[in-house]
Interface confidence: medium
């Protein structure tokens, strides 16, 4: 049967929810399926279900909730049905379902270089998604960055920063890097997905060194 | 004030490519959906793409799936159509269009409220 | 895909004349209709959303209904400038169809 598979805001000031749509062999035909939602004004739900208000827009299998259909201080309750049978149903309320979209413009600058010039720290930075209202306050996101050797499959992981820059130390030079960074809105929904990956190669030891002019 | 406006029509030979433009004004094209529907010379209406930028998706008519890209860049309020693999029945004027869901929370479905005035798209040897 | 069948695919009306055109669709679409006017060279225009609701600016003459999968736009006086062709259109999945439309036409 079709099942809810996910509810996502990108910045708290829309929403979409996706569902299965798979017809399993042996199973009954089902009907065109529909989603209604309902939401709870101060203490009681309104009884009163509608229907998805945008079908379109998030893509097949989808309702979306635009800016004037998406309130964050309201609970919603939605669910899926078909043939007036009611197959799927979940509530949530909108912070609850924050997943920004991934951090934009990464890059990087050298720090510092270990005196033996095998080490060296650098500061990673980048942008909080296009979309997510920082300077008003409207969203407050956390960072997560990981890193790796290019050739390596685990990844390592820093903890979670509310800054858009954060040093990485002791790297190894001669080798290239993998650097990513993901977001979540703070105290509440998942994190995103994450950025673009960026390709930090460290130069070699002599062009770290300062070459003496001998005369 | 809302506008749309095309642009990147001309002739093309078959098998070639073109890249339409959709520059939007008065609206955030990341909050909106855009699509593409065109129109062959004294023919109907017929939808292409859509493209929703906030919930990452696109979509695509049949009769161009694998041939035709949509996509937007947020940060330009424009949205664009890649045409590749052009066919002779792809000759039509191409509109862009805003998909609106209107802001009664209890009033559904929405609807393509703001087009743009449409550009040539010629496919012939 | 869901499809929009409209009929007539033309018509002759007068000035003042009541013109109803009707689309069915192939299965379910709620109420997820809209109904456009367009002229010859120019992009079309909407008048009427989910089935029945009127589009800011158009006359009140333009009014929608649905009955079940039938859905109606009337003009309930034909002026002048109605002359055109009216197309329907489903958005109750990604993938929008639209009608083969109807051209009205001075009798």
């Known amino acids: 049967e079709p099942k809810f598979t996910k509810c996502r805001s990108p910045e708290r000031e829309t929403f979409s929810c996706h569902w299965t749509d798979e017809v399993h062999h042996g199973t009954k035909n089902l009907g065109p399926i529909q989603l209604f939602y309902t939401r709870r004004n101060t203490q009681e739900w309104t009884q009163e279900w509608k229907e998805c208000p945008d079908y379109v827009s998030a893509g097949e299998n989808s309702c979306y909730f635009n800016s004037s259909f998406t309130s964050i201080w309201i609970p919603y309750c939605i669910k899926l049905t078909s043939n007036g049978g009611t197959v799927d149903e979940k509530c949530f309320s909108v912070d609850e379902i924050v997943q920004p979209d991934p951090p934009i413009a990464l890059n990087w600058t050298l720090l510092n270089v270990s005196l033996t010039g095998i080490h060296a720290d650098i500061q990673v930075r980048w942008e909080a998604p296009r979309n997510a209202d920082i300077q008003k306050g409207w969203m407050v996101l956390e960072y997560e960055l990981q890193y790796k050797e290019v050739n390596e499959t685990k990844w390592k992981m820093m903890d979670p920063i509310l800054t858009t820059s954060v040093p990485v130390y002791s790297l190894k030079v001669d080798k290239e890097y993998e650097v990513r960074v993901r977001s979540k809105q703070r105290n509440s929904g998942n994190y995103g997905e994450f950025s673009e990956v960026l390709y930090v190669t460290l130069p070699q030891m002599s062009q770290f060194t300062c070459e003496e002019d001998f005369y | 004030e809302v506008q749309l406006v095309e642009s990147g029509g001309g002739l093309v030979q078959p098998g070639g490519s073109l890249r339409l433009s959709c520059a939007a004004s008065g609206f955030n094209v990341y909050y909106s959906s855009i699509h593409w529907v065109r129109q062959a010379p004294g023919k109907g209406l017929e939808w292409v793409a859509s493209i929703s930028s906030s919930s990452g998706s696109t979509s695509y008519a049949d009769s161009v799936k694998g041939r035709f890209t949509i996509s937007a860049d947020t940060s330009k309020n424009t949205a664009y159509l890649q045409m590749n693999s052009l066919r002779a029945e792809d000759t039509a004027v191409y509109y862009c269009?805003?998909?609106?869901?209107?802001?009664?929370?209890?009033?559904?479905?929405?609807?393509?409220?703001?087009w743009g005035q449409g550009t040539l798209v010629t496919v012939s040897s | 895909d869901i499809q929009m069948t409209q009929s007539p695919s033309s018509l002759s009306a007068s000035v003042g004349d009541r013109v109803t055109i009707t689309c069915r669709a192939s299965q379910s679409v709620s109420s997820a209709v809209a109904w456009y006017q367009q002229k010859p060279g120019k992009a079309p225009k909407l008048l009427i959303y989910?089935?029945?609701s009127l589009y800011s600016g158009v006359p009140s003459r333009f009014s929608g209904s649905r009955s079940g999968t039938d859905f109606t736009l009337t003009i309930s006086s034909l002026q002048p400038e109605d002359f055109a062709t009216y197309y329907c259109q489903q958005s109750s999945s990604s993938l929008i169809t639209f009608g083969q439309g109807t051209k009205v036409e001075i009798k």
């Open positions: 989910s089935a029945s």
């Open positions: 269009a805003r998909y609106n869901s209107w802001g009664i929370w209890w009033r559904p479905f929405g609807a393509l409220d703001y």
